[in-house]
């Protein structure tokens, strides 16, 4: 048993038929000494009196808010939630398995920049009774700070029968420098607690690696004269790490058909403009890379041909 | 500097309704448990409600169960006490409070405290 908040437990249990729990022992929350009874949740059942009591936590029906009492006066409030091992493996009941990049994907995190600042984000078909506590750093042994902002619900999807619900948070590494090389991971960790259940979950990741930039902005087109060509030209998304010079991007440029069969013209460049063939119905569309480290493509910022 | 700033309290008729609000700010709100106390003049500080930070879980004091509603709003910071059936004896002014613990129903457990909002109720 483990203290997850002030008056909030984490009972871990072996979780198999006729396992035998564990004891533990509350402590009532006064100088009172004499008269102390404990009931369970809104039961008005007295379970025990003094001012300690002691339960066997086989089940969630023994989680709960134990509640000790005087003379019709409570005097103080212990929580008590579950968190499941069966074997050997924690539960992931809680959150859906995002399933990419790989198996076992529960949080999924993204920066837009080297500035330190990212956003992780977890999937539950849970719409109630649901509670999520963010904490991150840099490294594990000797952390460096990392602050995060409360989850918050992002979205909310149907999924066939299902309504799917998208958390989010936002994180910013206390003192990042962006420019230096990375050497520890950030570490995220998120505590769920649904209804008496407890879960948690983390992520290690490099920011370098969890990169996606905007899509690039301001896409202009100059149709060249004399010619079917056109020049197209972009800028830097506001939110992408400067000095361009240093944290540069490479863009690739795409000519598209109305159709999706139709076959797709890629070009890649290093610069903010390329010349290209606008086809009729046909659009162009954008997107951005860091240029020195493969990390995730931008989306498309695009324009119609026309 | 962690600030709670109540609002909503005024002159209100018996039987009548009030809801009373409490901005938050320079704390991590979704981290803290909220609780409204009240004091009446010449007595002792009372508790009235809190709300943990864990969802939807709360607790009333007898003398106000079946009348008043705590809620929060962890998007806005604000925590409400909606009170219904007002009677002369709710007259108080209504404090909030903040703390790391998880349902206390005593002072000593709250951290932080609000200036106060006056609610009168007149028969």
């Known amino acids: 048993i483990w203290e997850l908040k002030k008056d909030v437990y984490v009972v871990e249990l072996d979780w198999y038929p006729d396992a035998p729990g564990e004891m533990v022992v509350l402590t009532c929350d006064t100088p009172e000494e004499d008269g102390i009874t404990w009931t369970l949740d809104q039961s008005s059942e007295v379970l025990g009196s003094g001012k300690t009591l002691t339960i066997q936590v086989k089940e969630f029906g023994d989680a709960g808010q134990y509640t000790c009492h005087k003379g019709g006066e409570v005097l103080s409030h212990s929580l008590l939630l579950l968190h499941k091992k069966e074997d050997g493996i924690w539960s992931t009941d809680i959150l859906k398995d995002q399933k990419e990049p790989k198996n076992k994907t529960f949080l999924r995190c993204e920066a837009k920049n080297y500035s330190g600042r990212f956003t992780c984000w977890w999937l539950t078909t849970i719409s109630t009774d649901l509670t999520f506590s963010v904490k991150s750093s840099r490294g594990s042994s000797d952390p460096q700070g990392v602050t995060c902002g409360a989850a918050t619900l992002s979205a909310e999807r149907v999924r066939g029968d299902n309504k799917e619900y998208e958390y989010s948070v936002e994180c910013q590494e206390d003192s990042a420098c962006p420019a230096a090389e990375e050497s520890l991971p950030i570490e995220v960790m998120v505590d769920a607690v649904h209804k008496l259940k407890y879960e948690n979950y983390t992520s290690s990741f490099f920011i370098r690696d969890i990169i996606k930039p905007d899509p690039p902005k301001n896409l202009q087109l100059k149709p060249l004269k004399n010619s079917r060509q056109v020049e197209v030209s972009w800028e830097y998304p506001d939110t992408w790490s400067t000095p361009h010079s240093y944290f540069s991007l490479t863009f690739c440029v795409q000519v598209q058909g109305k159709s999706k069969r139709e076959k797709k013209d890629r070009v890649f460049t290093d610069k903010t403009s390329a010349t290209v063939i606008c086809r009729k119905n046909a659009s162009i569309s954008v997107r951005a890379q860091d240029r020195y480290y493969s990390s995730s493509w931008s989306e498309w910022a695009s324009v119609p041909c026309s | 500097e962690v600030q709670l700033v109540e609002s909503g309290g005024g002159l209100v008729q018996a039987g009548g309704s009030r809801r009373v609000s409490c901005a938050a700010s320079g704390l991590t709100f979704s981290d803290y448990s909220m609780a409204w106390f009240r004091q009446a003049p010449g007595k002792e500080r009372e508790f009235v409600a809190a709300h943990a930070w864990l969802a939807s879980t709360t607790d009333y004091a007898d003398s106000v169960k079946g009348r008043f509603t705590i809620s929060r709003d962890n998007a806005k910071n604000t925590v409400y006490l909606q009170m219904n059936s007002l009677k002369p004896e709710d007259t108080a002014a209504y404090y909030c409070?903040?703390?790391?613990?998880?349902?206390?129903?005593?002072?000593?457990?709250?951290?932080?405290w609000g200036q106060g909002t006056q609610v009168t109720v007149s028969s």
């Open positions: 409070a903040a703390g790391q613990r998880y349902l206390s129903r005593v002072s000593q457990g709250y951290e932080y």
